[in-house]
Interface confidence: low
């Protein structure tokens, strides 16, 4: 019968001829009376056999990532009779892996959006690298992820590539971050190859800023001839948030006389002071009212940022009109 061990050949061998192993018949007594032949894809071009001894050699550099095994056939013939000594047999040559491929991030570019002020541990995105080397061959394709840029705001789980928040971020200070992740094979041991990717992380706004009046005191005037409903002036607050998180509502906090009202212009986000009751210079020639401003939409979990609404004082002077 045929005698052989399993055949392995390392990929990327630079030698012109690399001995892989020996194929022989147990009837071969070593007197050179048998002839060994190799058939199949790669026979003669990639692999050759010593016709006398059955020794097999690789004569070309192999790439496991291109082809990881070769199925060949072997024959042994009695030179004297020309007849087959053993039935033709199929055997396999496996190409063993070396660490010749760096990890690659295939889903680039990465982009993620996460709410500002998210707590530590919040998941941002998972990045995944692929390594063409053999995952079953040692650590050649076992990857470890690390953060090259992005501290102290982000961290990456070494084995999963999951990026998490490690420190609260304020969109009003910086609204996007570039994070650079490295994937290293060989679980980071010597001889490891690496690849990197960039992740653009954008912070979405949350309502963590309350509106604040631009002025702590406003001065307005109203003519005693002004009809009810007259707009006598505007007040304005600013909010560092954006979009609906910056929409605000103005209201009267204090007006003992119940003479004025404030409505909100939702397009300009201004407060419009309105005359609710006619005024009479002879009766009262100045008024003091206090206004407050609050955001229109505040989720309950963000109310902590909105305790104590911003207030302002409005002094209103009544202008005298000569009466006939």
């Amino acid at each position: 019968g045929w005698v052989w061990n399993q055949f392995f050949v390392p990929e990327e061998m630079n030698t012109t001829s690399h001995h892989i192993g020996q194929l022989r018949s147990d009837l071969d007594n070593g007197n050179n009376s048998f002839q060994y032949k190799l058939l199949g894809a790669g026979a003669g071009s990639t692999f050759i056999i010593d016709e006398r001894t059955g020794d097999i050699y690789a004569i070309q550099k192999l790439d496991r990532e291109e082809r990881s095994l070769y199925i060949l056939r072997a024959q042994v013939i009695d030179i004297a009779t020309g007849r087959a000594v053993e039935p033709e047999s199929e055997f396999v040559i496996k190409v063993s892996d070396i660490n010749d491929n760096e990890p690659k991030f295939l889903d680039e570019p990465y982009e993620a959006i996460v709410p500002e002020m998210s707590p530590e541990g919040t998941l941002v995105i998972q990045v995944t690298a692929s390594d063409a080397d053999d995952p079953s061959s040692g650590n050649n394709a076992r990857l470890l992820y690390s953060l090259l840029q992005g501290q102290p705001y982000f961290s990456v789980e070494p084995t999963t590539g999951v990026i998490r928040i490690s420190s609260k971020m304020d969109r009003e200070l910086q609204d996007e971050y570039w994070v650079i992740i490295q994937a290293k094979d060989m679980i980071g041991q010597p001889g490891a190859l690496s690849g990197t990717t960039s992740v653009l992380i954008k912070l979405s706004d949350v309502n963590d800023n309350k509106p604040i009046f631009k002025e702590s005191l406003y001065r307005l005037t109203v003519s005693e001839s002004a009809p009810t409903g007259t707009s006598i002036g505007t007040i304005m607050a600013y909010d560092n948030d954006i979009g609906e998180n910056a929409e605000m509502d103005y209201s009267i906090e204090e007006d003992d006389s119940q003479t004025f009202d404030i409505i909100t212009n939702h397009e300009t986000q201004e407060g419009i002071v309105i005359l609710k009751k006619k005024v009479d210079f002879e009766h009262q020639n100045h008024y003091g009212i206090r206004a407050k401003v609050k955001n229109h939409h505040v989720p309950e979990q963000l109310m902590k940022y909105h305790t104590e609404a911003s207030t302002t004082f409005i002094k209103i002077q009544v202008e005298d009109v000569d009466e006939p």
């Epitope: 707590p119 530590e120 490690s166 420190s167 609260k168 304020d170 309950e300 979990q301 109310m303 902590k304 940022y305 305790t307």
Partner: antibody, heavy 119, light 107 residues
Framework: QVQLVESGGGVVQPGGSLRLSCAAS????????MDWVRQAPGKGLEWVAV????????YYADSVRGRFTISRDNSKNTLFLQMNSLRVEDTAVYYC????????????WGRGTLVTVSS | EIVLTQSPGTLSLSPGERATLSCRAS???????LAWYQQKPGQAPRLLIY???SRATGIPDRFSGSGSGTDFTLTISSLEPEDFAVYYC????????FGQGTKVEIK
Amino acid sequence: QVQLVESGGGVVQPGGSLRLSCAASGFSFSSYDMDWVRQAPGKGLEWVAVIWYDGSNKYYADSVRGRFTISRDNSKNTLFLQMNSLRVEDTAVYYCARETGEGWYFDLWGRGTLVTVSS
Amino acid sequence: EIVLTQSPGTLSLSPGERATLSCRASQSVSSSYLAWYQQKPGQAPRLLIYGASSRATGIPDRFSGSGSGTDFTLTISSLEPEDFAVYYCQQYGSSWTFGQGTKVEIK
């Protein structure tokens, strides 16, 4: 380990000043809003002041507004309470407390430091 | 400001008994914004319950919270020797206010 340690308490005369400190360790101090809560001898708990994680906003109880100032140094992981114009009724154990990220109840407290205002 | 009133002021019970502590608010408190703390003599308060009914990390399941609106309850199903302490409720929806405390003492 995760802890808060207050210091700076002592005996002071009415009208005097004291500065309390609270040293934080074992957690990312700069990520948390921090508060001072006090407890008069044999009495209940009273909230005093809060400062946001970055120091940008501060709020005070009516009883101390204008007299007490809360501040923090994130580079030194330390919270402060500057107490001026002290009154006898300010006598209490002062605790620093950490607010949670997802709410604003207090999940970590120090052991407290005693402030006694007495003539 | 929201005023919290705790009752009873003192609760005298034996180990193994059930303790029921009440906290009443002067105006409605969203149940998301009520916490319970335990305090032993000479020690800092310790968070037990938040959001009216969620147990804090490491708190045994004999402690439970319930209630909504203006009435809230802390229940200790079977008192252990280490549970004898003062318990405070706290609302944190409108500034921060605490109840005056309930002392649970050994009978």
